[in-house]
C-alpha cells in the first residue's frame, strides 16, 4: 500500500481467483484513543472499533472511503483504491490502446517546436467518476523539472455504438534548451482513477521524436506566363522554432484532386516556393518536416488551383526569438568552410537515417539505457552550439562537434560494427563512417589539434547485443548529426565570409 495523495491510498493486488489479498492497517488521524468506530462509504454499519482498523482487501467491495468517528463526529477519512495486477501485468482498463505507432500505446505526445512545450493526449470510453493527474520530468534517476497543467476533456467522438472521450494535457520543460542534443528522455506519468480503480500509464520520449510542425502558412499561387505551371510559395508556421536558418524545415508540395487515388504532381523542396502543374478542380497542398531529423510531417495546408489567392496554413503564436542579422567572423580561430560542412553534414543526416531507417520507430529504451547513451558525447546546453553561442564564438561548438565526429567515426570502425553480424564496407554504415571522417577533417585543418574523447569499452560479446548496441549508437548519431547540420546550415547562412 502506498499514499497517492493526502488520505488517498493505493492497494496493489495480485488479481486471480481465491487470491489472499492484502492485509491493510488503517490508523485514525486523531489524538483520541478510545470510543472510535469505523464505517465504509455511506454505510452506517460499524466495521470495528479502536484507533486502528485491520482489514483484508481482496476485491473492489473492500475498497472505498473508510471513516473513523467518535460520538457522531467524523475524525478522519482514508480512501482506498485498488491497483490490479493480473499475470504480472498491471491493468490498463481505463484508457484505450491507440495502437499507433505500436500496440500498447495509451499516451501520445506531440511538440510543435523545440521549445520544450508538448501536448499529450489519451482516449477512454468512460464518461463519469474519472480523474487524471499528470507528472513529468526529464530523466528518471536525477529528474529535471517539467511542469504540466491539468488534464482536460478536449474532444468527444462517436465510434459505432460507443462514445469516445479524448483528454489532453500541456507540459513545459522548466529549463528547455532548444538547440541542445537531448541525452535524457522526457518521462510522462499519468495517474488515472475510475471509481475505486487506480491505474498508471507512462510514456518516455525525446522531444525530437515527437516533433510535428504546424502546417506552412500563407500559401500563395502565381501562374507562370505561357505555361501550365504555377509558382506556389508559403512561409514557415509561426509556432516553429527560430531562427529558421538554424531550425530548418523541408517541404512536400502536392497537387491532387479531391479523391485520394487521383493522379498528382509532387515535389520535395528545402525552399519556401516550388513550381508545380495545377489542374482544374485540384488543390495545391504543402506540408513540412524537420529538415535534419525524420520526425512527423505536419498536416497539409491547402489552396485550390482555381483561385490564385492565399491560405493561412499555420496557427498559433510564435516560436522563440527572431534573428536574421549577419554574424561577425569567428573570434579565436579560423573559420571553417561553412558551406562544405553544411553539405557534408546534411549528407550525414541522410546516411544516418538510411543506415537504419526503422530505428526512429523502434523503442530501444530499456533498463539501464540512460547509462548506455551517456557513454556517447552529446552537444549540450553549454557547448555554444545555439545561434547565440555561434555568434559569440563558434570555436567552442566546432570543437565539440569535432570531438563527437571522431568519437562516432571510431565507434563505427570498432568491433561493434565490424564484428558479427557483418556489414559490407560500402553499406550505408560504411559510407557514414567515411563521411564522418571527411567532415572531421574539414573541421580540423592540418596543424590544428583539439583533444578527443576516449572511446568507452562498450564492446558486447553476443551478436544480438552487438546488433542492439548498433541500433542505439545509430539512434544517438542521428540526433548528433541533426544538431551538427543545424549548426553548419546556420553558419553557412550567417557566418560565411
Amino acid at each position: 500500500i502506498w499514499e497517492l495523495k493526502k488520505d488517498v491510498y493505493v492497494v496493489e493486488l495480485d488479481w486471480y481467483p481465491d487470491a489472499p489479498g492484502e492485509m491493510v492497517v488503517l490508523t485514525c488521524d486523531t489524538p483520541e484513543e478510545d470510543g472510535i468506530t469505523w464505517t465504509l462509504d455511506q454505510s452506517s454499519e460499524v466495521l470495528g472499533s479502536g484507533k486502528t482498523l485491520t482489514i483484508q482487501v481482496k476485491e473492489f467491495g473492500d475498497a472505498g472511503q473508510y471513516t473513523c468517528h467518535k460520538g457522531g463526529e467524523v475524525l478522519s477519512h482514508s480512501l482506498l483504491l485498488l491497483h490490479k495486477k493480473e499475470d504480472g501485468i498491471w491493468s490498463t482498463d481505463i484508457l484505450k490502446d491507440q495502437k499507433e505507432p505500436k500496440n500498447k500505446t495509451f499516451l501520445r505526445c506531440e511538440a510543435k517546436n523545440y521549445s520544450g512545450r508538448f501536448t499529450c493526449w489519451w482516449l477512454t470510453t468512460i464518461s463519469t467518476d474519472l480523474t487524471f493527474s499528470v507528472k513529468s520530468s526529464r530523466g528518471s534517476s536525477d529528474p529535471q523539472g517539467v511542469t504540466c497543467g491539468a488534464a482536460t476533456l478536449s474532444a468527444e467522438r462517436v465510434r459505432g455504438d460507443n462514445k469516445e472521450y479524448e483528454y489532453s494535457v500541456e507540459c513545459q520543460e522548466d529549463s528547455a534548451c532548444p538547440a541542445a542534443e537531448e541525452s535524457l528522455p522526457i518521462e510522462v506519468m499519468v495517474d488515472a482513477v475510475h471509481k475505486l480503480k487506480y491505474e498508471n500509464y507512462t510514456s518516455s520520449f525525446f522531444i525530437r521524436d515527437i516533433i510535428k510542425p504546424d502546417p506552412p502558412k500563407n500559401l500563395q499561387l502565381k501562374p507562370l506566363k505561357n505555361s501550365r505551371q504555377v509558382e506556389v510559395s508559403w512561409e514557415y508556421p509561426d509556432t516553429w522554432s527560430t531562427p529558421h536558418s538554424y531550425f530548418s524545415l523541408t517541404f512536400c508540395v502536392q497537387v491532387q484532386g479531391k479523391a485520394k487515388r487521383e493522379k498528382k504532381d509532387r515535389v520535395f523542396t528545402d525552399k519556401t516556393s516550388a513550381t508545380v502543374i495545377c489542374r482544374k478542380n485540384a488543390s495545391i497542398s504543402v506540408r513540412a518536416q524537420d529538415r535534419y531529423y525524420s520526425s512527423s510531417w505536419s498536416e497539409w495546408a491547402s489552396v485550390p488551383c482555381s483561385g490564385s489567392g492565399s491560405s493561412r496554413g499555420g496557427s498559433g503564436s510564435g516560436g522563440s526569438g527572431g534573428g536574421g542579422s549577419k554574424l561577425r567572423a569567428v573570434p579565436g580561430g579560423s573559420s571553417p568552410a561553412w558551406t562544405q560542412c553544411q553539405q557534408l553534414s546534411q549528407k550525414l543526416c541522410t546516411l544516418a537515417w538510411s543506415a537504419h531507417p526503422l530505428v526512429g520507430h523502434m523503442d530501444l529504451r530499456e533498463e539501464g539505457d540512460e547509462e548506455t547513451t551517456n557513454d556517447v558525447p552529446h552537444i549540450q546546453c553549454g557547448d555554444g552550439c545555439d545561434p547565440q553561442g555561434l555568434r559569440d564564438n563558434s570555436q567552442f561548438c566546432l570543437q565539440r562537434i569535432h570531438q563527437g565526429l571522431i568519437f562516432y567515426e571510431k565507434l563505427l570502425g570498432s568491433d561493434i560494427f565490424t564484428g558479427e553480424p557483418s556489414l559490407l564496407p560500402d553499406s550505408p554504415v560504411g559510407q557514414l563512417h567515411a563521411s564522418l571522417l571527411g567532415l572531421s577533417q574539414l573541421l580540423q585543418p592540418e596543424g590544428h589539434h583539439w583533444e578527443t574523447q576516449q572511446i568507452p569499452s562498450l564492446s558486447p560479446s553476443q551478436p544480438w547485443q552487438r546488433l542492439l548496441l548498433r541500433f542505439k549508437i545509430l539512434r544517438s548519431l542521428q540526433a548528433f548529426v541533426a544538431v551538427a547540420a543545424r549548426v553548419f546550415a546556420h553558419g553557412a547562412a550567417t557566418l560565411s565570409p
Partner: antibody, heavy 118, light 107 residues
Framework: QVQLVQSGAEVKKPGASVKVSCKAS????????LHWVRQAPGQGLEWMGW????????EYAPKFQGRVTMTTDTSTSTAYMELRSLRSDDTAVYYC???????????WGQGTMVTVSS | EIVMTQSPATLSVSPGERATLSCRAS??????LHWYQQKPGQAPRLLIY???QSISGIPARFSGSGSGTEFTLTISSLQSEDFAVYYC?????????FGGGTKVEIK
C-alpha cells in the same frame, strides 16, 4: 494490369513527320499522365513531354517545343506523339509511359523504333 | 536545365557482390530523384522513387539514398538478372532529365 502497347517500327525520310501511337488498357485512361521518352541507339534516355488525357494539357521539353505534338483519344484510350521535321539524329526508340504521379515513369510501353534515313 | 551525372560509366562486379552506383545533380534537387533499370532490348523499369522509396515487386536488395546533389543506388548482392544499365532521373523541375547511365557488367 496497366499495359501500354505501341505502334510498330517506322522508317522516315529527313524533313518528314512521324506519328507514334500508344494504346492503354487495364485502367481508366484519364486517371494517369502520359509521357513520351526517347532513346537514341546506344544512348541514354531523353524526356520529350507529357499530356494529361483528362483535359489535353501538355508540357514539352524546350528542345522539342514547336516540333512535337502530343494528343489523346479518350474514346479509344490511345495517346499519340507526332514529331515533325525529322532529322537523322531523331533516330531512336520512342517510349510512352503512364503514371498517376506526374514526374516519374512507372509503366512503360514496349517502345517504337523510328529510323530517319535518306 | 538540371544536368545529371552518373558514375562510373561502367561497373564490373562479380555475382553476389555489392554494387554502389552514384548520381550527381548540377544543383540541389532535395529528394526528387528516381532510379530505373534497363536490360538490352527492353523498356526501362522503375526501381526506386524519391531517392529511397521502394517499389512493390522490386527485390529488397535494391536500395537508394541521398538528398541535395548526391545520390546512391545500392544493390546489396548482385544476382545474374541485375546486370543491366541503371539510370537516375530528376523531377525537381521541368524539363525532366536523366543521367547518362551506369552499365553494371559481370566481372
Amino acid at each position: 494490369q496497366v499495359q501500354l502497347v505501341q505502334s510498330g517500327a517506322e522508317v522516315k525520310k529527313p524533313g518528314a513527320s512521324v506519328k507514334v501511337s500508344c494504346k492503354a488498357s487495364g485502367y481508366t485512361f484519364t486517371d494517369y499522365y502520359l509521357h513520351w521518352v526517347r532513346q537514341a541507339p546506344g544512348q541514354g534516355l531523353e524526356w520529350m513531354g507529357w499530356i494529361d488525357p483528362e483535359n489535353g494539357d501538355t508540357e514539352y521539353a524546350p528542345k522539342f517545343q514547336g516540333r512535337v505534338t502530343m494528343t489523346t483519344d479518350t474514346s479509344t484510350s490511345t495517346a499519340y506523339m507526332e514529331l515533325r521535321s525529322l532529322r537523322s539524329d531523331d533516330t531512336a526508340v520512342y517510349y510512352c509511359n503512364a503514371n498517376k504521379e506526374l514526374r516519374y515513369f512507372d509503366v512503360w510501353g514496349q517502345g517504337t523504333m523510328v529510323t530517319v534515313s535518306s | 536545365e538540371i544536368v545529371m551525372t552518373q558514375s562510373p560509366a561502367t561497373l564490373s562486379v562479380s555475382p553476389g557482390e555489392r554494387a554502389t552506383l552514384s548520381c550527381r545533380a548540377s544543383q540541389s534537387i532535395s529528394i526528387n530523384l528516381h532510379w530505373y533499370q534497363q536490360k538490352p532490348g527492353q523498356a526501362p523499369r522503375l526501381l526506386i522513387y524519391f531517392a529511397s522509396q521502394s517499389i512493390s515487386g522490386i527485390p529488397a536488395r535494391f536500395s537508394g539514398s541521398g538528398s541535395g546533389t548526391e545520390f546512391t543506388l545500392t544493390i546489396s548482392s548482385l544476382q545474374s538478372e541485375d546486370f543491366a544499365v541503371y539510370y537516375c532521373q530528376q523531377s525537381n523541375s521541368f524539363p525532366l532529365t536523366f543521367g547518362g547511365g551506369t552499365k553494371v557488367e559481370i566481372k
